[in-house]
């Protein structure tokens, strides 16, 4: 139904609404230098930006949340920009028996929505 | 490993951190009175509260986000409180041919975490 359709154009201006942004971080930044051996520099895609009414609503709950935030802003928070999907990353890290490669499926965001 | 474990005790005081809260809303509040027939009053469980460092981290990405927010607060937002699961709700609503019952799986939150 029409009432459930989220919108994709940002009413706040370019770059202001929920989107994917790359943040560069070292293992030291993450506090991982004692157990992760590589990569030593990570390109971390993260979800940033605001979630104005109906923008990229994740689901029915997010649409309701946006509506109720308009009515009760002190009681109900606005939806916020979080990952909708992730892309895997391989880390080489220490193990008790030496070194291993492990894929992390929930480390780097691939898409964002408002939840 | 220890570095990936989120914590469950709220350092900000009771009720301040990310949790499930029930918000009462009418069909009028939601703008649904023209197409939903019942229930006319909904008990909507929503996720509210703050996400201090490591609190109920959804996954590795959320842990990283919390860490980078501490280092670059202007660039990286803090994790925010969103549903981790939903509970289904049945709505009776109008259709072109009359009335039908429909289950919505993503309308009411059942659990919350920081993402």
């Amino acid at each position: 139904s029409a009432h459930l359709h989220p919108r994709d154009s940002c009413p706040l201006g370019p770059g202001r609404c929920c989107h994917l942004e790359t943040v560069q971080a070292t293992l030291e930044d993450l506090g991982w230098s004692d157990w992760v051996l590589s990569p030593r520099q990570l390109q971390l895609s993260m979800c940033v930006g605001e979630c104005p009414h109906l923008y990229r609503s994740a689901n029915t709950h997010a649409l309701i949340k946006a509506r109720l935030h308009g009515l009760q802003p002190d009681r109900v928070p606005a939806p916020c920009c979080v990952p909708s999907s992730y892309t895997p990353v391989v880390l080489m890290h220490r193990t008790d028996s030496g070194v291993s490669l492990q894929t992390y499926d929930d480390l780097v965001a691939q898409g964002c929505h408002c939840a | 490993s220890a570095h990936l474990h989120p914590r469950d005790s709220c350092p900000l005081g009771p009720g301040r951190c990310c949790h499930l809260e029930t918000v009462q809303a009418t069909l009028e509040d939601l703008g649904w009175s023209d197409w939903v027939l019942s229930p006319r009053q909904l008990q909507l469980s929503m996720c509210v509260g703050e996400c201090p460092h490591l609190y109920r981290s959804a996954n590795t990405h959320a842990l990283i986000k919390a860490r980078l927010h501490g280092l670059q607060p202007d660039r990286v937002p803090a994790p925010c409180c969103v549903p981790s699961s939903y509970t289904p709700v049945v709505l009776m609503h109008r259709t072109d041919s009359g009335v039908s019952l429909q289950t919505y799986d993503d309308l009411v939150a059942q659990g919350c975490h920081c993402a």
Epitope: T22, S33, D34, L37, S38, P39, R40, Q41, Q43, S45, T87, P88, V89, V90, L91, M92, V99, L101, T103, Y104, L107, V108 | -
Partner: antibody, heavy 119, light 112 residues
């Protein structure tokens, strides 16, 4: 299992742009989050790392070649590509694509393709 | 760039006998995490290089245990405990501590 295969012209004229593609089969280029590198080997000589790209499109280049190199990824075709501009005879080499963790641990290599720069 | 120097250039070997290749870097490859960022590769005749050892001493998957890597800082050694005929080819060390990664000039191992 995952395999890499280089393709492109075997002969390029001086001053032109060398273009090569590495096709990944048996797995998705965007799954696993590896670094995808290009490495070359001049005839009878050692190995030289050219650069790498990650799933997100972020690139890393050897400073000695940076001004002439472009590496890109096409996830829809499961390929990544190398472009080397303004080539000279010194760019004649076997070009390999490889998968690594950062710029190390190249555990998977293509079979290599010889590119000759000559008029 | 970090310069990698290998010796000898050529190494004639007898099957069943041990062999040793040296690699020296122009600066220390020892990271503060305690690991040496050095890989060893073997390029068999007419083939692509294959990873043997990573992070100084860790054998890559499928590599026979007759291959071992040792050393720290600037001096590294690849040892083959008992050379087999299939071990012939050019061995390269590669530093991965700093970008760009750089390779040694190679050591050609051939059967006497």
């Amino acid at each position: 299992q995952v395999q890499l295969q280089e393709s492109g012209p075997g002969l390029v004229k001086p001053s032109q742009t060398l273009s090569l593609t590495c096709t990944v089969s048996g797995g998705s280029i965007s799954s696993g989050g590896y670094y995808w590198s290009w490495i070359r080997q001049h005839p009878g000589k050692g190995l030289e790392w050219i650069g790498a790209i990650v799933y997100s499109g972020h690139t890393y280049y050897n400073p000695s070649l940076k001004s002439r190199v472009t590496i890109s990824v096409d996830t829809s075709k499961n390929q990544f590509s190398l472009k080397l501009s303004s080539v000279t005879a010194a760019d004649t080499a076997v070009y390999y694509c490889a998968r690594g963790v950062e710029y190390q641990h190249f555990s998977l290599w293509g079979q290599g393709t010889l590119v000759t720069v000559s008029s | 760039d970090i310069v990698m120097t290998q010796s000898p250039l050529s190494l004639p070997v007898t099957p069943g006998e041990p062999a040793s290749i040296s690699c020296r870097s122009s600066q220390s490859l020892l990271h503060s995490n305690g690991y040496n960022y050095l890989d060893w590769y073997l390029q068999k005749p007419g083939q692509s290089p294959q990873l043997l050892i990573y992070l100084g001493s860790n054998r890559a998957s499928g590599v026979p245990d007759r291959f071992s890597g040792s050393g720290s800082g600037t001096d590294f050694t690849l040892k083959i405990s008992r050379v087999e005929a299939e071990d012939v080819g050019v061995y390269y060390c590669m530093q991965t501590l700093e970008a760009p990664p750089t390779f040694g000039g190679g050591t050609k191992v051939e059967i006497k």
